[in-house]
Amino acid sequence: LTCLGGFASPGPVPPSTALRELIEELVNITQNQKAPLCNGSMVWSINLTAGMYCAALESLINVSGCSAIEKTQRMLSGFCPHKVSAGQFSSLHVRDTKIEVAQFVKDLLLHLKKLFREGQFN
């Protein structure tokens, strides 16, 4: 019976739903932020253009021991077609600019909201 339960599981999440859920998670992070997010860890800033999901993941994956962004990291991996591991860097990183995780999340959230408003889900 437990095996049969698998047949009832939903198919792939529509891109609009996935983006909505990522936005909701980032909103939760910004709302629930009491102490500095991830102890004020710094990450590479990224260009918010095509390929930014992988770039965002590459930046955030270098933050370890921060449970607040673990779900975001998992969700971003669903948007990134290739495997990302710590220490990886793409050309989308603004390599001379590091910002706090809290600011990174804020910038990413604003950009994703605009993509959602414009209907750009992929």
Epitope: S16, L48, K106, L110
Partner: antibody, heavy 125, light 112 residues
């Protein structure tokens, strides 16, 4: 507090161009879309186009495509609307407006929630 | 382009009485993201327009609860439960779902 202050009235000759400015204060324009809407004398409102100041992406009404250019300067918190090849039918009050995105709701597109005072552009020979 | 058609174009109302303005779109205005960006604006004489309602029924901050929006798909309504003298002006519906975004032609509310 939130304010959108537009440049003053203009009188232009047919065939010339006009550039109207909209100076924002009380918020960051990169957190918004900035829109331009016009209203001919005694007529209704007509949306012309919008810009995302964070990246310069624009959307225009096809009717104005090629004649209108909307730009934004984040450093001065100012949006601009330039209309070229002016004709008498372009005589109107031109408004800027913003749509803000905040951090606290998953879906918070607030439509055109603040407007400038309007700029009268008169096209006459 | 999507055409937004309002009715009536003129609406004389007695203070204290309700008022209703209809707005019909020439095609469905549900956005690809599932939202319907249908908005209502009021332009008082000599003033810039101001936002009343967004996403069909969400009242903008500071807008009295006498104002309410409803509808779906292609048919939308703005209701004022009890009209006050200060409500005079031209009411515009607007769709921001499909580019080019478009306004209705306006409904002039006046006091009888």
């Amino acid at each position: 507090q939130v304010q959108l202050v537009q440049s003053g009235a203009e009188v232009k000759k047919p065939g010339s161009s006009v550039k109207v400015s909209c100076k924002a204060s009380g918020f960051y324009i990169k957190d918004t879309y900035m829109h331009w809407v016009r209203q001919a004398p005694g007529q209704g409102l007509e949306w012309m186009g919008t810009i995302d100041p964070a990246n310069g992406n624009t959307k225009y009404v096809p009717k104005f495509q090629g004649r209108v250019t909307i730009t934004a300067d984040e450093s001065t918190s100012t949006a601009y609307m330039e209309l070229s090849s002016l004709r008498s039918e372009d005589t109107a009050v031109y408004y800027c407006a913003r749509s803000i995105f905040d951090d606290y709701h998953y879906d918070d597109y607030y439509a055109m929630d603040y407007w400038g005072q309007g700029t009268l552009v008169t096209v006459s020979s | 382009d999507i055409v937004m058609t309002q009715s009536p174009l003129s609406l004389p109302v007695t203070p204290g009485e309700p008022a209703s303005i209809s707005c019909r779109s020439s095609q469905n205005i549900v956005h690809i993201n599932g939202n319907t960006y249908l908005e209502w604006y009021l332009q008082k004489p000599g003033q810039s327009p101001r936002l009343l309602i967004y996403k069909i029924s969400d009242r903008f901050s500071g807008v009295p609860d006498r104002f309410s929006g409803s509808g779906s798909g292609t048919d939308f309504t703005l209701k004022i439960s009890r009209v006050e003298a200060d409500d005079v002006g031209i009411y515009y519906c607007f769709q921001g779902s499909h580019v080019p975004w478009t306004f209705g032609q306006g409904t002039k509310l006046e006091i009888k």
